[in-house]
Structures are given as structure tokens and as C-alpha cells.
Amino acid sequence: RQQWELQGDRRCQSQLERANLRPCEQHLMQKIQRDEDSYGRDPYSPSQDPYSPSQDPDRRDPYSPSPYDRRGAGSSQHQERCCNELNEFENNQRCMCEALQQIMENQSDRLQGRQQEQQFKRELRNLPQQCGLRAPQRCDLEVESGGRDRY
């Protein structure tokens, strides 16, 4: 391959190593968890739950505390820090895609349901635009099957 491509790869690699993508992971997982709490895709069997009032079993308690509720504007804080990190990839679409792939890879074993995984991918694809950045045109967020439970 051309010399400049190799240099570009190396530059992207060092950018990825320098970047702290944790705020992005936190922001996205928070969104998914908030939606779980509010819209309740998790059926909870009323017959098993002596505490549960007679209610739609697919409904979850929207007032259940989230680990972030007590941290004030935790979510927007994470998003802001996430956007600052992604901004570093603004001029390299392929590298932006690799950053998104890394986020997906890091969180894939946290997402054990089809809906959760699909929503995470959807939110992840929208992340650059939410940050006012250009989104990569083609970016494959599929994760290879893992042999063991990563953490």
C-alpha cells in the first residue's frame, strides 16, 4: 500500500490509543438504561412478584433510581466529554469509524438482548451527528463472536 496510507494507519492507531472513549460508553449505556427504565422492554412476571401491583408486566417503574440520577447532569457531562474525544477524529472518517467500532467492541458483551444491541448500534451511529461532526459513510459495527465473556 501507499506510504501515506501506512502513515495514516499509524496516525489513527496513535489517536485511538490516546483517546479516552469511556465517556462515550457511559453516555450510550446510560441512554439505553434510561429507556429500559422508562419503557420497560423487560417482562417481569406478576405471578412471581408478590410486591408488584396489578399492572402491565411489560411496564417498568420509571421512578426507579438510576446510578446517574444522583450525579446531577451526568449524562450531558458524559456526552460533552465524549464529543470532545470524537472531535479528534473529525478529519479522518476511517479513524472515526474505528473509534466507533472500538466502543461497540468494548460494550458488546454488556448487551445480551437483540433490542439492547440494536439500540446501542443506532445510538452509536448517531453519536458523531449528535456531536455536530460528520458521521462515517460506511462503518460496520458488527462484532465477531467472542470465545469467552469479556469484561
Partner: antibody, heavy 117, light 111 residues
């Protein structure tokens, strides 16, 4: 919304048994599923997990190579094939639904497996 | 493997009084996504277990607000502000960070 286990019974050491779990009231194919067991008078032990798309399967060390978890999404059924059974496998086996975010939000009533000569 | 240790293993309680159960993990359960992968389950006599708390502090649907979970990293606590007779049973903590592992269980009964 329920999980109903079946297939338990008495089996001799070294024997085999296949447990089934019929799911209803939710979209089975969208969720990871687990098997958790409880020996008589003892605590809970996680046994096996299968992802919604079967991409990943995980097992506790003590059953690796002997137990196989599988699922048939068209029948909304989870299976646990247990081979080379040992006395220490005697337990109530629960079928459990993963919330999608790794916590367990629906449990079956359990089926008793007794390994004894 | 992550080892979960609960204390006490037996807890006699008086209805109306508070109670708390401790759970310690052999390594931190705080993931890079900011969540603690620690859940609490209650198994009432003759019943299947049921979810009480997930992600360390989130109360499951239908669980009364007298139950709360706290802690981060390796040390977690389940609190019951005022114990009721229906709260008796065995309480288990479970880590879901790396595979899944339960604590030994804490038997709560009325004094």
C-alpha cells in the same frame, strides 16, 4: 409471562438427561437465557448462558465439556443437555431470562434433577 | 473467577426494624461504562428467586421502596428500612461483570 422447565428426574451417575424450558409471554428470540441450579439446602449457582442469536455460549467450569446449552427460537424453547452426570449435579435447575443487560428478571419454577445410583 | 462473599449468613430481624446485608467481591464490579454489575435477589421459602436490585442501586419493577442498594467497586449493601414479615427468605448478591457468580446467601427470618 412465564418459563416452564421440564425433563428433570432420577438418573444414574454417568447418565444423561435433557432439560427443556418453554417460554411464553415475551419475545423469546430477543433475549439471552440462562440455566441456574440450586443443590438441596444450598445456594444458587449459575450454570450456563446462551445469547439470543446463539453467538456466544458460556458455562461454569464444573460443567464444561459435559453440559450443552441450546435453543430453538421457532419453538421458544431453551435446552440443557447434561451428559456424564455426577452426584454433585443433583439440584433444582432453573430456567432464567436475561434482561438484555445481564441481570436476571424472570425465573421459572425449576425442575429437580437427582443423580443417584 | 470473581468470588462473592456475603455477611452475615444469618440475620434474625424484628418487624419494623431496619436490616442490612453486606456483599463483597474479590475484584471491582465497576465497568468502564460506569455501571456496577451487582444485583440482589430474594428467594422466599418454597419459591423461585426474584430480582430486587440491579446495577447496584436500581430497584426492580414492583419492589417496595423500603429496599435499597448502595455501594461501588467491591463493597455493596442491601438495606431494608423497615422489615416486614413478607421479607423473610434468602437474599443473594450476584456479580454480572465477568460471567455470573452468586454470593452464599443470607437467611433473613423473624426473631
Amino acid at each position: 409471562v412465564q418459563l416452564v422447565e421440564s425433563g428433570g428426574g432420577v438418573v444414574q451417575p454417568g447418565g444423561s438427561l435433557r432439560l427443556s424450558c418453554a417460554a411464553s409471554g415475551f419475545t423469546f428470540r430477543d433475549y439471552g437465557m440462562h440455566w441456574v441450579r440450586q443443590a438441596p439446602g444450598k445456594g444458587l449457582e449459575w450454570v450456563a448462558f446462551i445469547r439470543y442469536d446463539e453467538r456466544n455460549k458460556y458455562y461454569v467450569d464444573s460443567v464444561k465439556g459435559r453440559f450443552t446449552v441450546s435453543r430453538d427460537n421457532s419453538k421458544s424453547t431453551l435446552y440443557l443437555q447434561m451428559n456424564s452426570l455426577r452426584a454433585e449435579d443433583t439440584a433444582v435447575y432453573y430456567c432464567v431470562k436475561d434482561s438484555g443487560l445481564r441481570y436476571f428478571n424472570l425465573w421459572g419454577r425449576g425442575t429437580l434433577v437427582t443423580v443417584s445410583s | 473467577d470473581i468470588v462473592m462473599t456475603q455477611s452475615p449468613l444469618s440475620l434474625p430481624v424484628t418487624p419494623g426494624e431496619p436490616a442490612s446485608i453486606s456483599c463483597r467481591s474479590s475484584q471491582s464490579l465497576l465497568h468502564s461504562n460506569g455501571y456496577n454489575y451487582l444485583d440482589w435477589y430474594l428467594q422466599k421459602p418454597g419459591q423461585s428467586p426474584q430480582l430486587l436490585i440491579y446495577f447496584g442501586s436500581n430497584r426492580a419493577s414492583g419492589v417496595p421502596d423500603r429496599f435499597s442498594g448502595s455501594g461501588s467497586g467491591t463493597d455493596f449493601t442491601l438495606n431494608i428500612t423497615r422489615v416486614e414479615a413478607e421479607d423473610v427468605g434468602v437474599y443473594y448478591c450476584m456479580q454480572a461483570l465477568q460471567s455470573w457468580t452468586f454470593g452464599q446467601g443470607t437467611k433473613v427470618d423473624i426473631k
